[in-house]
Amino acid sequence: AAPCPDACCPHGSSGLRCTRDGALDSLHHLPGAENLTELYIENQQHLQHLELRDLRGLGELRNLTIVKSGLRFVAPDAFHFTPRLSRLNLSFNALESLSWKTVQGLSLQELVLSGNPLHCSCALRWLQRWEEEGLGGVPEQKLQCHGQGPLAHMPNASCGVPTLKVQVPNASVDVGDDVLLRCQVEGRGLEQAGWILTELEQSATVMKSGGLPSLGLTLANVTSDLNRKNVTCWAENDVGRAEVSVQVNVSFPASVQLHTAVEMHHWCIPFSVDGQPAPSLRWLFNGSVLNETSFIFTEFLEPAANETVRHGCLRLNQPTHVNNGNYTLLAANPFGQASASIMAAFMDNPFEFNPEDPIPVSFSPVDTNSTSGDPVEKKDETPFGVSVAVG
């Protein structure tokens, strides 16, 4: 085959080699860029910057080699469009530093930086950590800082990510309140900071204020949906990024729903309870307190991480006709009480009018009028019966 006269020539089915001296000063408009998985660049003294726009359209790129060239600066977001990049060789260039942001989000199996005039500073603390932790083949390169000795010996005591403190209100927060959060940022070389509010949606009206080193956030007219939602403050410096998440507890009264009993490995009376703080629960059976046992007990489902509502069952492991009756769930927190009732019939009485039947659990009378509070919507409360042959 005739030698390729171009600056860049195909190499294999999806590779490109650019080795003709001084032919490139940027990576724009590389031929067949969208399908490239491998790009090898050498002897390009005029290629001094690598930026976001240079690698746009190289979404399939896995291996990138730029060696023996004039690379001085790699932008922090240079590899944003090459998420599959796994091998990066930038050896024998003019790089003095490389931001931690440049490699963030990539799963690099190999990073080669030998032969660069690196300048030891906190900005290379991340690279020193890679060396310590044996990542990306960095330890084998025994990287040196220009005129300063091995990277491994760089003092790092003062090289910390920012420190964040988020102040939340001590007092109880009620629905409709305005809440002011403040994020205090400390540390050297602070670059950027902000709030992540993706979980909030319709939970409040958001107003940001202030800037480094003190960021303010007002959550106006909060709703109960704000509970269990993360409000995150973040800050970055040349060493790395720090995040702190807080949650604002918005108080609201207890509510409860009961549903028709279902047979699920024995029996379950399903319920849902909500409220902040989490309400305490009590069951009544035919108006008397039901003391829970290993055969009649409350069992909660795994809670969703981002909501206050809890779902569960009153488990009746072996109900018979003596368990037929009216079940009431009482829920209470400092902001209100609620109750819901349902009739359940598990089995016909095979010993009709038999006074010998034991009471299955210990009961104590309760003043049911004490469960005052707003009425709660009750669903599926039609009584039902199931006949089961005994024996």
């Epitope: 909660f300 488990r315 492991n317 072996q318 018979t320 039947d357």
Partner: antibody
């Protein structure tokens, strides 16, 4: 697999207390009730009480109510049964057993407690 | 308390025999459960919810009954079946066991 491993044999004097442990593994400790059952030499099984690790709810057999205390440490998936003011007729093998939807599915190997002056 | 009375208290039988143990409750219970215990060992769940076989239990074991009267049947005794059997109720506190039926080789 599910295992309930109990603490070793104890010899106690009358009037003393004994605390037996039952370490669970192989299942979610907080989802199951733990029962304590004892068996005197050559005798039948006697239920002492039960505890629900999820909320530390306990039910005791009235016979032992003033002398028995059942507790759990969910951080190490362990249940405890302490019996105080021991008498010679408390000499027995003490078992833990777990239940959720069915009774006493799995049992510990037993802990022999001897009360003797 | 619900008292459970097993009969017989002890029983001699031969390999291959059909054996029946009964458990009578002082008041109605919804279900009965049965355990097998061998000397020096913890009890092992045999039958639960009156008639369900616990995992790994041979089909020669069966249970039946309702109300106050329940039965454990072994259709054809095997050498490993010689042990003590207990019934138990799980319907009211305190949970109670029968006094046991000792099954020995004739």
């Amino acid at each position: 697999q599910v295992q309930l491993v109990q603490s070793g044999a104890e010899v106690k004097k009358p009037g003393a207390s004994v605390k037996v442990s039952c370490k669970s593994s192989g299942y979610t400790f907080t989802n199951y009730w733990m029962h304590w059952v004892r068996q005197a030499p050559g005798q039948g099984l006697e239920w002492m009480g039960e505890i629900y690790p999820n909320n530390a709810r306990v039910n005791y057999n009235e016979k032992f109510k003033n002398r028995v205390t059942m507790t759990v440490d969910i951080s190490i998936s362990t249940a405890y049964m302490e019996l105080s003011r021991l008498r010679s007729d408390d000499t027995a093998v003490y078992y833990c057993a777990r239940s959720r939807y069915d009774p006493m599915e799995d049992w510990g190997q037993g802990t022999t407690v001897t009360v003797s002056s | 308390d619900v008292q459970l009375t097993q009969s017989p208290s002890s029983l001699s039988a031969s390999v291959g025999d059909r054996v029946t143990i009964t458990c009578s409750a002082s008041s109605s219970v919804g279900y009965m459960h049965w355990y097998q215990q061998k000397p020096g060992k913890a009890p092992k769940r045999l039958i639960y919810d009156t008639s369900k076989l616990a995992s790994g239990v041979p089909s020669r074991f069966s249970g039946s009954g309702s109300g106050t009267d329940y039965t454990l049947t072994i259709s054809s005794l095997q050498p490993e079946d010689f042990a003590t059997y207990f019934c138990q109720q799980w319907s009211s506190i305190p949970l109670t066991f029968g006094q046991g039926t000792r099954l020995e080789i004739k």
